[in-house]
């Protein structure tokens, strides 16, 4: 009867989740494998949060407000094994737009979710972030190493989007 | 004072060049963008070009993309719009722009007095 | 690319009065509490003037009888009181994502 009370809760939440999300991919997870976390196919997850890599090319407001119409935000970078995690799906020869921008020219960075900025937990490449006018950050691969650049916000470049995984 | 002089405009046939220069003065050129705007006679601004301050970015549209090339020399303050393939609808005055940057987009916020192309045979 | 449509294209203004121009964008041009339209003015055999930038931000030194307003896609320049030198071309123009446009333009004449 638990048992199946719980099927009944799950499959009412995928049908909710069905309208934003076509489909789901979900895996069993918990310390009895009996929660399920998703992610809307075809994103990938990693730890708490599900990413996909957008290849249009937009500006950075227009690629935030893409993520933002998905339900997501453009990526914020957390820990040095996101960071792997992420760009072991990108193409080297692109740039991708991080949820990381300096609206005024200050230097002042802020993430679009307000998570703060920490200094300590940044992946510059070496002599980044350079110019005031460039005030939108990707992420591209550079000297063997993949790493963030600051950008002007205008010139259309890839994304990335990250969401927080959906448990039912 | 800032100004912003441009030169080279002048009659020319369809399919020829010609190369507009505008000299800067009176702020740090090496540190703005810079642009070409044209205006066709009796008609709006249209942007032509666009380079970064490092001269890392160029842009064009579609209709002068693969024929005009935008260039800049920060030691000797000056910009340049090299026009290959010119057409009778390159005709305009051609104005360089300062770019000032305003949180995700820009301004012109100076503009020079303009150099007139005409293109006819 | 992002249209700008300005309307009225000619408006006839007396002195004294207050004229509206309005510019309507093909897609959003805000981003939060940035709004990103701007403002120029040319008269006659000169070049464009910045007038206003980030939709409601008066350029030093211009009149303050010039005030923008506006957000998303629907951006108003506005002139109170009207002076007989601010016979015009006035173009509206964004530049959130490359290419930058202006609008066609609204020819404001004094009566």
């Known amino acids: 009867n638990f048992m199946y009370s719980k099927t009944v809760k799950r499959l009412s939440k995928l049908q909710e989740y069905q309208q934003y999300y076509p489909s789901l991919t979900c895996v069993m997870e918990g310390k009895d494998m009996e929660d399920w976390s998703c992610c809307p196919t075809p994103w990938t997850s990693f730890q708490s949060s599900c990413y996909f890599i957008s290849t249009v090319m937009q500006s950075w407001t227009k690629s935030q407000n893409n993520c933002s119409v998905m339900g997501a935000d453009l990526v914020v970078i957390n820990t040095k094994e996101e960071q792997d995690f992420i760009t072991q799906n990108l193409k080297i020869n692109s740039a991708y737009f991080l949820g990381l921008s300096d609206p005024k020219g200050w230097r002042h960075w802020q993430w679009v979710d307000q998570t703060p900025y920490n200094k300590n937990v940044t992946f510059w490449h070496s002599g980044e972030p350079n110019s005031p006018d460039e005030r939108c950050a990707i992420i591209n691969f550079r000297s063997e190493e993949w790493g963030w650049n600051d950008v002007h916000c205008h010139v259309p470049q890839k994304s990335i989007c990250k969401m927080k995984k959906i448990y039912i | 004072e800032v100004q912003l002089v441009e030169s080279g405009g002048g009659l020319v046939k369809p399919g020829g060049s010609l190369r507009l220069s505008c000299a800067a003065s009176g702020f740090t050129f090496s540190s703005y963008g810079m642009s070409w705007v044209r205006q066709a006679p009796g008609k709006g601004l249209e942007w032509v070009s666009t380079i970064s301050s490092g001269d890392s970015y160029t842009y064009y549209p579609d209709s002068v993309k693969g024929r005009f090339t935008i260039s800049r020399d920060n030691a000797k303050n000056s910009l340049y719009l090299q026009m290959n393939s010119l057409r009778a609808e390159d005709t305009a005055v051609y104005y360089c722009?300062?770019?000032?940057?305003?949180?995700?987009?820009?301004?012109?916020?100076?503009w020079g007095q303009g150099t007139t192309v005409t293109v006819s045979s | 690319d992002i249209v700008l449509t300005q309307s009225p294209a000619s408006l006839a203004v007396s002195p004294g009065q207050r004229a509206t121009i309005t510019c309507r964008a093909s897609?959003?041009?805000?981003?939060?509490?940035?709004?990103?339209m701007h403002w120029y003015q040319q008269k006659p055999g000169q070049p464009p003037k910045l007038l206003i930038y980030g939709a409601s931000n008066l350029e030093s030194g211009v009149p303050a009888r010039f005030s923008g307003s506006g957000s998303e896609t629907d951006f108003t320049l506005t002139i109170n009181p009207v002076e007989a030198e601010d016979t015009a071309n006035y173009y509206c123009?964004?530049?959130?994502?490359?290419?930058?446009?202006f609008g066609g333009g609204t020819k404001v004449e004094i009566k």
């Open positions: 897609e959003s041009v805000s981003f939060r509490t940035s709004h990103l």
């Open positions: 123009q964004q530049s959130i994502e490359d290419p930058p446009t």
């Open positions: 722009a300062r770019q000032i940057y305003y949180d995700y987009a820009y301004y012109f916020d100076f």
